[in-house]
């Protein structure tokens, strides 16, 4: 019991202190003494909730003593000085160091004064994101994978996407005891429209100043999607040569283009040049359906286009096509 009328002394310390696995951390603890107040400190003691005995003691005449001398150190307390700073440094933080600690001052005439501090042991996770290359399955499959490895506590992963889809997130023990690896998959029904688009994995963790954003460019393998362009329904005799183009979207890229007609091989006035078909001027009307067959590693797809070359007004010297 302090003498009547004395202003009280206060032990000041943060309620929570973060430290990183394997690093050192200081548990700050100070005795705040009001201006007119007198106090005399004889011992500083640190103990851990749920454990027997004290882990560190600084005694007015005996100096410091530690339960684990290689891992603990009073930062400022020295023999022959006023014991007002009980701050304790812990080296080589381990997962099992996380918990509640009591910092206590033995004082006269006020008696013992203490404060509790929660030590959080953190581990900064390593984050990676990668594409999961897929084909047109027709059902939901993972198209991107985001992994946060060795975090403590576990990282929080979210996804940002304009493509629809949903996450599937799981946890597993990390390499270091007490750490967690979080794996999150972004799942959707693959389509050619998704190929080349991006999704963003957002990883949040106590150890980060701001969330980490990892962008993944999606890959969907699909057979060619084919169309033919270059014909405007306005081709006439005696006009310049014209070109049809076989437009193909595919992943992987097309490996071959094959032009033909519904009647079989190409007529003499049609010359294939890869994805293009050159139509030379003709002297009589034609009505031909051209076929472009495109092949890639996943298969072949084709498109058809019927071209009519008509007798027409000779005043237009522009050619058979607008090209």
């Amino acid at each position: 019991w302090p003498p009547p009328g004395t202003g009280d002394i206060i032990v000041q310390a943060p309620t929570q202190v973060p430290g990183f696995l394997g690093d050192s951390v200081t548990l700050p603890c100070y005795l705040q003494v009001p201006g007119m107040e007198e106090t005399h400190v004889s011992q500083l003691t640190w103990s851990r909730h749920g454990e027997s005995g004290s882990m560190a003691v600084f005694h007015q005449t005996q100096g410091p003593n530690y339960s684990e001398p290689k891992r603990l150190e009073f930062v400022a307390a020295r023999l022959g000085t006023e014991l007002r700073d009980a701050s304790l440094r812990m080296f080589g933080l381990r997962v099992e160091d996380e918990g509640n600690y009591t910092c206590l001052f033995v004082t006269f005439p006020q008696g013992s004064r203490s404060v509790d501090i929660w030590l959080r042991v953190l581990a900064k996770p390593q984050n990676t994101a990668e594409v999961q290359k897929v084909q047109l399955t027709g059902k939901p499959v993972p198209v991107a994978r985001c992994v946060s490895t060795g975090g403590r506590p576990p990282a929080h992963i979210t996804w940002h996407s304009d493509l629809g889809g949903m996450p599937n997130t799981s946890q597993a023990p990390g390499f270091l005891s007490g750490t967690v690896t979080v794996t999150s998959l972004w799942i959707l029904v693959p389509s050619s429209q998704v190929d080349g688009k991006s999704v963003t994995c957002k990883v949040e963790h106590e150890s980060f100043e701001k969330p980490q954003l990892l962008t993944v460019n999606l890959t969907v393998y699909y057979p060619p999607e084919v169309s033919i362009s270059g014909y405007d329904n306005n081709w006439y005799l005696s006009q310049n040569e014209a070109t049809l183009t076989c437009d193909a979207r595919s992943n992987p890229e097309p490996t071959g283009y094959n032009w033909s007609t519904t009647m079989g091989p190409l007529p003499p006035f049609a010359v294939a040049q890869g994805a293009q078909l050159l139509i030379r001027p003709v002297d009589k009307p034609i009505n031909t359906t051209f076929i472009c067959n495109v092949t890639n590693a996943l298969g072949a797809r084709q498109a058809e286009l019927t071209v009519q070359v008509k007798e027409g007004p000779p005043s237009e010297p522009s050619g058979m096509s607008s090209n």
Epitope: W1, E38, S42, G53, V57, H59, Q62, S112
Partner: antibody
């Protein structure tokens, strides 16, 4: 070498007062609190109170409040304990002890006998 | 006031024996417990502070343990010169209080 040397034995009548001295040497007197503990013959130890020589702050066991006065003389590095209104149950060996949270050095003790 | 209950109050042991004295506080005192040895006709001598730390010069056969309410003083191998009375004391809160003592005799 730290030494606490107490004054000699006292025989007192009930109702009287006794003042015991504790002269210290071997350390800086003003850096440590001095406490007093008593021990009736063949019995346990009982804390009486303590005083810090610097500003004279004191803390007393309520059992002795009003009967005990602790003082110091910084010039001679001596602590004093005065106990008044003595009764027979105050018969005991009285110790001064330097305080470091626990008591690391003790005087040799002063026997106070209260008898009519 | 915090009561410190020591047991046993007296015991007899042979040289070389392992001796254990316990002290139970009536409420939580953390680790603010000291142990003293008092030989006949002498003042107490500090052995242990903060429940488990030996004073310099105290033989390492003396050890203390415990926290909260239950404390132990152990003499790992009793020597003839350990004949004495042993006291525990709490300094968690005023008034400071002592156990009633354990008188240790040598067989």
């Amino acid at each position: 070498e730290v030494q606490l040397v107490q004054s000699g034995s006292e025989l007192k009548k009930p109702g009287a007062s006794v003042k015991i001295s504790c002269k210290t040497s071997g350390y800086t007197f003003t850096e440590y609190t001095m406490h007093w503990v008593r021990q009736p013959h063949g019995k346990g130890l009982e804390w009486i109170g303590g005083i810090h020589p610097n500003q004279g702050e004191t803390s007393y066991n309520q059992r002795f409040k009003g009967r005990v006065t602790l003082t110091v003389d910084k010039s001679t590095s001596t602590a004093y304990m005065e106990l008044s209104s003595l009764r027979s149950e105050d018969t005991a060996v009285y110790y001064c002890a330097r305080w470091t949270g626990d008591f690391d050095y003790w005087g040799q003790g002063t026997l106070v006998t209260v008898s009519s | 006031d915090i009561q410190m209950t020591q047991s046993p109050s007296a015991m007899s042991a042979s040289v070389g024996d392992r001796v254990t004295i316990t002290c139970k506080a009536s409420q939580n005192v953390g680790t603010n417990v000291a142990w003293y040895q008092q030989k006949p006709g002498q003042p107490p001598k500090a052995l242990i502070y903060s429940a488990s730390y030996r004073y310099s010069g105290v033989p390492d056969r003396f050890s203390g343990s415990g926290s909260g309410t239950d404390f132990t003083l152990t003499i790992s191998s009793l020597q003839a010169e350990d004949l004495a009375e042993y006291f525990c004391q709490q300094y968690e809160s005023y008034p400071y209080t002592f156990g009633q003592g354990t008188k240790l005799e040598i067989k």
